[in-house]
């Protein structure tokens, strides 16, 4: 797995470099997670033909994966920093159960899946420090998450491959939208 942001050899070799600002650290963290997702998507696409055939084979997606909407205030039109930040943190917290599901779904990229999961936890902590209105952030119910995990794992191999593909695609889109929004803050 790649080395997490701030721990690469260049950082060690350049002690004179200005420490990263909070925004730069968040930006770097998201880009690091996106790199990890790319690697996981590569394995998923190589292993099955989900990436090409998923659209026509998918009748219904009840995963309720977090998605940015106009009302969340993260788009350029109607941008609202506080509302958007709450949405990003809430969305990442909701993605955690799906990232847990991804563990053990990869053979050659097992470490990468773990790195994506752990880096997301760190990202949530960074963002929570940035957020003022923490009261507005709802944490997913652990019992509901446990039940969801059981349902996902009950699916057969083919559906689990499809689910993995959908999670990675949605998480990538969510992070890309978050990155664009955070750069406006």
């Amino acid at each position: 797995a790649p080395v997490p942001p701030g721990e690469d050899s260049k950082d060690v070799a350049a002690p004179h470099r200005q420490p990263l600002t909070s925004s730069e650290r968040i930006d770097k963290q998201i880009r690091y997670i996106l790199d990890g997702i790319s690697a996981l998507r590569k394995e998923t696409c190589n292993k099955s033909n989900m990436c090409e055939s998923s659209k026509e084979a998918l009748a219904e997606n009840n995963l309720n994966l977090p998605k940015m909407a106009e009302k969340d205030g993260c788009f350029q039109s109607g941008f609202n920093e506080e509302t958007c930040l709450v949405k990003i943190i809430t969305g990442l917290l909701e993605f955690e159960v799906y990232l847990e599901y991804l563990q053990n779904r990869f053979e050659s990229s097992e470490e990468q899946a773990r790195a994506v999961q752990m880096s997301t936890k760190v990202l949530i902590q960074f963002l929570q420090k940035k957020a003022k209105n923490l009261d507005a952030i709802t944490t997913p119910d652990p019992t509901t998450n446990a039940s969801l995990l059981t349902k996902l794992q009950a699916q057969n191999q083919w559906l689990q491959d499809m689910t993995t593909h959908l999670i990675l695609r949605s998480f990538k889109e969510f992070l890309q939208s978050s990155l664009r929004a955070l750069r406006q803050m």
Epitope: A57, A154, N156, W158, M162
Partner: nanobody, 125 residues
Framework: QVQLVESGGGLVQAGDSLTLSCAAS????????MGWFRQAPGKEREFVAA????????HYADSVKGRFTISGDNAKNTVFLQMNSLKPEDTAVYYC??????????????????WGQGTQVTVSS
């Protein structure tokens, strides 16, 4: 172990109607997505319709939309396929299928875990 048993097939005239039934035993239906597939001689098995019990949502192949209706009786653990305005090209063996989980519902046959033996539907012109 889940067992699916289809019934209701037969020989009908073009334009007629027919209702297929699929009775399941071994587990309650609520945890499944249920589907109907068909296979004509020399052709691949194709998706016809699907239903999710928990949400009551239905899906159809374009070729049967507006003519076929999938429904279910939760209490009796039975799923139905009401086929109206039948055409000769609807002739096939019809299979009932069940998929665990229902979080992702698919039109692809590998998504389904359990299959019935099939019931023959023949539509003559």
């Amino acid at each position: 172990q889940v067992q699916l048993v289809e019934s209701g097939g037969g020989l009908v005239q073009a334009g007629d109607s027919l209702t297929l039934s699929c009775a399941a035993s071994g587990r309650p239906f609520s945890s499944f997505a249920m589907g109907w597939f068909r296979q004509a001689p020399g052709k691949e098995r194709e998706f016809v319709a699907a239903i999710t019990w928990s949400r009551g949502t239905t899906h159809y192949a374009d070729s049967v939309k507006g003519r076929f209706t999938i429904s279910g009786d939760n209490a009796k653990n039975t799923v139905f396929l009401q086929m109206n305005s039948l055409k000769p090209e609807d002739t096939a063996v019809y299979y009932c299928a069940a998929a665990d989980g229902w979080k992702v519902v698919s039109t692809a046959s590998p998504a389904y875990d359990y299959w019935g033996q099939g019931t023959q539907v023949t539509v003559s012109s």
